[in-house]
Amino acid sequence: MNGSEYFVKIQSFLGGAPTEDLKALSQQNVSMDLATFMKLRTDAVLPLTVAEVQKLLGPHVEGLKAEERHRPVRDWILRQRQDDLDTLGLGLQGGIPNGYLVLDLSMQEALSGTPCLLGP
């Protein structure tokens, strides 16, 4: 069974998938569409890297531009380095500026909804 066939079989169960499962899926050429991606748990999407999301979505990665202001895409963008987002070539804006350090302070983030940044 190829990645696409596997994805079709598990698609309806993905809404509650944890980050680890999404990372694993990204290695299987599943080409997840944005309709499915947008239904994933935000907390499961946030830890994914740009490279992982690119692999997870495959050719559908262009759809991130269409949903850049909607959750979970918006929240995911805020967590990525702008340099990494730029590699997608989609014109996504709102990533962490170059030279900034991200402090993973869970309490700070829980309160503000965004990661804590330290300037250069």
């Epitope: 944005l34 309709a35 991606f37 947008m38 531009k65 269409a66 202001r69 909607h70 959750r71 014109g91």
Partner: antibody, heavy 119, light 106 residues
């Protein structure tokens, strides 16, 4: 068959509010955002905003930020747009139109609701 | 916001004639969509992502362009194609539409 069914014409007084429904059928409601578009008489189209049925998250054209509120009722696959503090400038035809998540074109449109604001 | 300027505003064509209308963006956009609207009806998607024909649209229609300049071409005019045509960009919020080109039949 995909359908976006809007309500009939509305005549309301200045200062009042109105809530326009858009009842959908024939597709998976949560696979599409619902966008709303304004067309004043004899004029072009203006994008008001869109809402994601999965998160209830709405995004607005800044021009309509204080005019429109978009909501959805997933149980009935219906989207709503409420317009408040109505003036004659709000007299127009309002369309709901669907946009597949990840795409930026509107492939099916409602028939439009004509709103007339007059005392 | 990005302003889309359509030209001409009004044009007429004879049956069988080729028709081209343009849409100019105030700054670069990724893709362009085109819609057809007849009096008393809702807009109808014709072309999406610059050059893709929407479902059920006659092959007479085609779209092209990049950057700030886009066009819609009808290879052979028919009476049924008399309508107003709108371009729409999706690259920058808010989404915007052009002012329209009204196409009449001679």
């Amino acid at each position: 068959e995909v359908q976006l069914q809007q309500s009939g014409p509305e005549l309301v007084k200045p200062g009042a509010s109105v809530k326009i429904p858009c009842k959908t059928s024939g597709y998976t409601f949560t696979d599409y955002n619902m966008d709303w578009v304004k067309q004043s008489h004899g004029k072009s189209l203006e994008w008001i905003g869109d809402i994601n049925p999965n998160t209830d998250g709405a995004i607005y054209n800044q021009k309509f930020q204080n005019k429109a509120t978009l909501t959805v009722d997933k149980s009935s696959s219906t989207a709503y747009m409420e317009l408040r503090s109505l003036t004659s400038e709000d007299t127009a035809v309002y369309y709901c139109t669907r946009r597949k998540l990840g795409r930026k074109f509107f492939d099916y449109w409602g028939q439009g609701t004509t709103l007339t604001v007059s005392s | 916001q990005i302003v889309l300027t359509q030209s001409p505003a009004i044009m007429s064509a004879s049956p069988g004639e080729q028709v081209t209308m343009t849409c100019s963006a105030s700054s670069s956009v990724g893709y362009m969509n085109w819609y057809q609207q007849k009096p008393g009806s809702s807009p109808r998607l014709l072309i999406y992502d610059t050059s893709n024909l929407a479902s059920g649209v006659p092959v007479h229609f085609s779209g092209s362009g990049s950057g700030t300049s886009y066009s819609l071409t009808i290879s052979r005019m028919e009476a049924a194609f008399a309508a107003t045509y709108y371009c729409q960009q999706w690259y920058v919020y808010p989404y915007t539409f052009g002012g329209g080109t009204k196409l009449e039949i001679k």
